[in-house]
C-alpha cells in the first residue's frame, strides 16, 4: 500500500486510480495513508470521478476514512438516493490522518476511467465547533497554525487543563458592617474548576449574620452529600455546610466577627450559584438620654458598636464637661456595650461678671448679678468729666458667651474724657496777667526735666507740648517729671504722671528755627479726670472762625513774670491774635533771620506789649473758646518770641495746632 508523504515533508499531492486517465483494471485494491503535522488536517477534493455505479457502492468504490470513522464511500459519477459521488465536495480528515482506499471488483460492464484527487494539509480551526458541541475554550479561543490556545477574562486564570477558566475568587475581605457577596458571575452559571475563599472580617465585638437571598443552585447528587460543587462557611467557633442543591439555606447567626466562606466547583455542570447578604450586630449601648436643654442626634432605635451620637444644645446653652467647655460632643459605642465618654451637660451660657469700665460703672438690668444668656447690663460713664464713645452702653449676654453691644461689639465701651471744660468765664476783655483759680486751666501740665516747661493734657494719657521744650528728653522719656492738677508750681500736692514715649514732629529741627515746634508725650498710665485735671479739646475744622485776627486767646503758665522770676502760682493772660503779615514783618528785622514766622505759626499779643508768654511757658496751650460747643480748644502752643518778653512791636509766636491735626491723630491712633 503506497504511503503518502509524512510530516515534516510538505503535505500535498495528487492521487489517481491505477491507469488514470485510462480505464482502471478489475480486481484492484489500492490504499493511501496521508499524515499531516499535529494541529493540521487533510483536505481532499476530486477533479475527476468515474467509477462503476452499484447499490451502496458494493462493486467499485473509493472509501475515505479518518481514524475509525468512515467519512464517505463514493462511486458512480453523480449521487443518487442511496449512492454518493463526490461531485464538487471537499472532504476533511477528522484528525491529522486520512486513509483513502480504492477497490474495483472482478468485472465492469463498460470501461470506467477512475478518479483523480488532490490533497493538502491545512490548519485546523479548533476554535470553531459544531452547534451543540462543547466549546473548545471556556472563555476566549485563539487559533494559530498547527494549534490553538485558550485565555480567560479578567478575574480568571487558565486551569492546568489549558481549557477551563478558574475564577480568581480568593482573598476578598469584606470589612463593612453589612454587604453582599455571591458566586462568580451570579446569577449566570458559575465557573468550573474554581476554589473561592471570601472573608468577612469585622472589628472585635461585632457578630456576623448571613442570609442567603434570591436563589441558590449548586450542583448536587441524589445520594452523596455535595460531592461535586459545595459551599462551606467557617467561623472560629464552628463550620456550617457543605451546602449544595437548590434550596436556600437558613439564616446563619455566626456569633463571630470573622467568617470564611469557601466555594469549590468541579469541571462540569451548569448552575447559577448563590448570593449572601450579610449584616452584623453587637452588644447595644445604653440608650442615650439627652441632657436638659439638649438633644441627641442621630436618633436610632438602638446603638451598637461603632455607632455614635452627638449632643446639640439649645441656643443659649453650651456643652460643658464640668467646668471645661466643649464645642462639640460625640460619644462612640464600644465593644463592651459602654459609651466611650460620659454625657456632658447643656448649661445655660454664662458671660460671667462684666469687666470693669475704666472711668465708668456697670449696672445689672435683668437682676442683681445675673450674667446668663439674654441678661442685660448697662454701662455708663462718670458724669460731667467722661462721655461714652459711639455706644449706648447696653450689653446683652449672647449665646457665644460674650457681652455684646446693640451694634454687635464685644469690646468694652470707651469712656472718653470730656475736653475743654473750665471753671473760668471770659468777658473777652484784655487785661493784665492774672493768677489762675482752681479749675480755670485744668489741662495745664507742668513739665520738669532739664528746664521748666508746660504742656496741655489731651484725652487722658497724652500731653501736647512744644518740640523744643522736650527735645533733650526725646530718647529718655522717663526723665520727664510731669505734674498736673495743681496751681502752685512748688506745691507737693499734685498728680504725678510719667512719660512712656516722646514723639517730636519729624519736621522740627532743633536750634534751626521753630517751624513744626510740636511734640506729643504718651503717658504710661491714664490719669483720672476731675475738675482740676481735664483735657483740652483739639480744634474742630470750623475752629478757624474763632481764631481770626483780634480774637482773644488765653495763654497760661508758670513762666517768667515782669519781675524776672518763674511764677509760683499759675498765671494766665488774654491776648488777641495778631495779623499774620504784621507778625511776619515784626520778625524780619535783625536780629531775626528772614522767614522766622512760617505758615505753621500764629502770633498773639499787644502791639504796645506788656502781655505775653515767656520762658518757662514753652509748650503751654494758647486756648480759645468755641462758642458753639462752649468748650475750650487749643489753637496754639507757646513756641518763641522776642528776647524780651512783652516787648512793644513784638509778639508771642505759637505753633498753629490746626495745621497738625492729622499728625496728632495718626500718632495717637498708632500708639
Amino acid at each position: 500500500t503506497p504511503l503518502g508523504p509524512k510530516w515534516p515533508e510538505p503535505v500535498f499531492g495528487r492521487l489517481a486510480s491505477p491507469g488514470f486517465p485510462g480505464e482502471y483494471a478489475n480486481d484492484q485494491e489500492r490504499r493511501w495513508t496521508l499524515t499531516a503535522p499535529p494541529g493540521y488536517r487533510l483536505r481532499l477534493y476530486f477533479t475527476h470521478f468515474d467509477l462503476e455505479l452499484s447499490h451502496l457502492c458494493e462493486y467499485d468504490f473509493v472509501k475515505l476514512s479518518s481514524g475509525a470513522k468512515v467519512l464517505a464511500t463514493l462511486c458512480g459519477q453523480e449521487s443518487t438516493d442511496t449512492e454518493r459521488a463526490p461531485g464538487k465536495d471537499t472532504f476533511y480528515s477528522l484528525g491529522s490522518s486520512l486513509d483513502i482506499t480504492f477497490r474495483s471488483d472482478y468485472s465492469n460492464e463498460k470501461p470506467f476511467t477512475g478518479f483523480e484527487a488532490f490533497y493538502a494539509a491545512e490548519d485546523i480551526d479548533e476554535c470553531q465547533v459544531a452547534p451543540g458541541e462543547a466549546p473548545t475554550c471556556d472563555h476566549h479561543c485563539h487559533n494559530h497554525l498547527g494549534g490553538f490556545y485558550c485565555s480567560c477574562r479578567a478575574g480568571y486564570v487558565l486551569h492546568r487543563n489549558k481549557r477551563t477558566c478558574s475564577a480568581l475568587c480568593s482573598g476578598q475581605v469584606f470589612t463593612q458592617r453589612s454587604g453582599e457577596l455571591s458566586s462568580p458571575e451570579y446569577p449566570r452559571p458559575y465557573p468550573k474548576l474554581s476554589s473561592c475563599t471570601y472573608s468577612i472580617s469585622l472589628e472585635e465585638g461585632f457578630s456576623v449574620i448571613l442570609d442567603f437571598v434570591e436563589s441558590f443552585d449548586v450542583e448536587t447528587h441524589p445520594e452523596t452529600l455535595c460531592p461535586y460543587d459545595f459551599l462551606k462557611i467557617q467561623t472560629d467557633r464552628e463550620e456550617h455546610g457543605p451546602f449544595c442543591g437548590k434550596t436556600l439555606p437558613h439564616r446563619i447567626e455566626t456569633k463571630s466577627n470573622t467568617v470564611t466562606i469557601t466555594f469549590v466547583t468541579d469541571e462540569s455542570g451548569d448552575h447559577t450559584g448563590w448570593k449572601i447578604h450579610y449584616t452584623s450586630t453587637a452588644q447595644p449601648c445604653p440608650y442615650p438620654m439627652a441632657p436638659p436643654n439638649g438633644h441627641v442626634s442621630p436618633v436610632q432605635a438602638k446603638y451598637i458598636l461603632k455607632d455614635s451620637f452627638s449632643i446639640f444644645c439649645e441656643t443659649g446653652y453650651e456643652l460643658l464637661q464640668g467646668h471645661l467647655p466643649l464645642k462639640s460632643f460625640t460619644a462612640v459605642c464600644q465593644k463592651d456595650g459602654s459609651w466611650d465618654r460620659p454625657m456632658p451637660a447643656c448649661s445655660i451660657v454664662d458671660c460671667g461678671p462684666p469687666d470693669d469700665l475704666p472711668s465708668g460703672r456697670v449696672e445689672y438690668i435683668t437682676g442683681p448679678g445675673v450674667t446668663t444668656y439674654k441678661a442685660v447690663i448697662q454701662y455708663s460713664c462718670e458724669e460731667t468729666f467722661y462721655t461714652m464713645k459711639v455706644n449706648d452702653g447696653k450689653y446683652v449676654c449672647e449665646a457665644d458667651g460674650f457681652w455684646t453691644s446693640s451694634k454687635g461689639e464685644k469690646s468694652l465701651p470707651v469712656c472718653e474724657p470730656v475736653c475743654g471744660l473750665s471753671a473760668r468765664t471770659t468777658g473777652g476783655r484784655i487785661y493784665g496777667g492774672q493768677k489762675a483759680k482752681p479749675g480755670d486751666f485744668p489741662w495745664q501740665v507742668l513739665i520738669l526735666g532739664g528746664t521748666t516747661a508746660a504742656g496741655a493734657l489731651l484725652y487722658d494719657n497724652w500731653v501736647l507740648t512744644a518740640a523744643h521744650a522736650v527735645y533733650e528728653q526725646k530718647h529718655d522719656a522717663s526723665a520727664l517729671d510731669i505734674r498736673m492738677g495743681t496751681l502752685k508750681r512748688l506745691s507737693p500736692h499734685y498728680t504725678q504722671a510719667w512719660s512712656e514715649a516722646v514723639f517730636i514732629h519729624e519736621g522740627y529741627t532743633h536750634d534751626a528755627g521753630f517751624d513744626n515746634d510740636i511734640a506729643l508725650i504718651k503717658l504710661n498710665n491714664k490719669v483720672v479726670i476731675n475738675s482740676n485735671i481735664t483735657p483740652i479739646c483739639l480744634p474742630r475744622k470750623e475752629a478757624e472762625s474763632f481764631m481770626r485776627t483780634d480774637d482773644i486767646g488765653t495763654a497760661s503758665g508758670w513762666g517768667l513774670t515782669q519781675r524776672g522770676f518763674l511764677a509760683r502760682n499759675l498765671m494766665y493772660v488774654d491776648i488777641p491774635i495778631v495779623d499774620h503779615q504784621k507778625c511776619t514783618a515784626a520778625y524780619e528785622k535783625p536780629p531775626y533771620p528772614r522767614g522766622s514766622v512760617t505758615a505753621n505759626m500764629l502770633c498773639a499779643g499787644l502791639e504796645s506789649g506788656g502781655k505775653d508768654s515767656c520762658r518757662g511757658d514753652s509748650g503751654g496751650a494758647l486756648v480759645f473758646l468755641d462758642s458753639e460747643t462752649e468748650r475750650w480748644f487749643v489753637g496754639g502752643i507757646v513756641s518763641w518770641g522776642s528776647m524780651n518778653c512783652g516787648e512793644a512791636g513784638q509778639y508771642g509766636v505759637y505753633t498753629k495746632v490746626i495745621n497738625y491735626i492729622p499728625w496728632i491723630e495718626n500718632i495717637i491712633s498708632d500708639f
Epitope: Q321, G322, H323, L324, P325, L326, K327, S328, R341, P342, G352, D400, G401, F402
Partner: antibody
C-alpha cells in the same frame, strides 16, 4: 498628632510681667476644647492658672485673676499667658495643655523670678 | 475652691501588687475627675478622665472609679515602670484643682 510647645524667657525680674506663648500644631485651637496654662513650682504639685476656650472665652483661677491675662492669636494657632507683678513665688515650670477628651501637654518651660 | 485630698501621700509596694490611691473632694464634683501620672522630670500624663474612662494607650491595669466626692485609682498589677507621682484633678468647677500627689515606689 497634636503638639504643644511653650516659649518665652526663662528669667523674669520681680514686679515685671511674665509672658509665655504656646504654639499648637496638629489641631486648631478654634476647633474645640479649652486651652490651659498649668504650673508646677519646684518640688511641689500642680496649679491650674486658667484657660482660653475654642471661642476665645477665658476662665482664670481666682487666686491669680487680678494678675493673669490669657489671649490667643488664631492666625498663628497660638495662645499666650501674661502674669503681671511677679514674685519669687511665681517661679515654676509652666505647662500649656489641652485637657479632658484630648489630653496633650507641652514639655514645660522653667521660669525663674529673680533680680 | 474645691480641695482634693489624696491618700496616702506616699506608698511602697511590690511588683505584681494591687495598688489603690484614693482622692476625696471637699464637695460634690460629679464624675469630673481625672488622674495623672508624673514621672520624675517628666510632663504629667493623663491616665483616666471622667472618673473611670481610660485614655487610649493607657495599660488596662490602670482603672478609675467613684463619683460625687470619693474617687479611686487602682493599679491591678504593679509594674516597675509605674514608679511615679499620681495626681487627681477635679474639673467640675472653677478653679480646677489638683490633689497634692501620691508618690508610688517599688519595694
Amino acid at each position: 498628632e497634636v503638639q504643644l510647645q511653650e516659649s518665652g524667657p526663662g528669667l523674669v525680674k520681680p514686679s515685671q510681667t511674665l509672658s509665655l506663648t504656646c504654639t499648637v500644631s496638629g489641631y486648631s485651637i478654634t476647633s474645640d476644647y479649652a486651652w490651659n496654662w498649668i504650673r508646677q513650682p519646684p518640688g511641689k504639685g500642680l496649679e491650674w492658672i486658667g484657660y482660653i476656650s475654642y471661642s476665645g472665652r477665658t476662665s482664670y483661677n481666682p487666686s491669680l485673676k487680678s494678675r493673669v491675662t490669657i489671649s490667643r492669636d488664631t492666625s498663628k494657632n497660638q495662645f499666650s499667658l501674661k502674669l503681671s507683678s511677679v514674685t519669687a513665688a511665681d517661679t515654676a515650670v509652666y505647662y500649656c495643655a489641652v485637657l479632658y477628651a484630648l489630653d496633650y501637654w507641652g514639655q514645660g518651660t522653667t521660669v525663674t523670678v529673680s533680680s | 475652691d474645691i480641695q482634693m485630698t489624696q491618700s496616702p501621700s506616699s506608698l511602697s509596694a511590690s511588683v505584681g501588687d494591687r495598688v489603690t490611691i484614693t482622692c476625696k473632694a471637699s464637695q460634690n464634683v460629679d464624675t469630673n475627675v481625672a488622674w495623672y501620672q508624673q514621672k520624675p522630670g517628666k510632663v504629667p500624663k493623663a491616665l483616666i478622665y471622667s472618673a473611670s474612662y481610660r485614655y487610649s494607650g493607657v495599660p488596662s491595669r490602670f482603672s478609675g472609679s467613684g463619683s460625687g466626692t470619693d474617687f479611686t485609682l487602682t493599679i491591678s498589677s504593679l509594674q516597675p515602670e509605674d514608679v511615679a507621682t499620681y495626681y487627681c484633678q477635679q474639673y467640675n468647677s472653677n478653679p480646677l484643682t489638683f490633689g497634692q500627689g501620691t508618690k508610688l515606689e517599688i519595694k
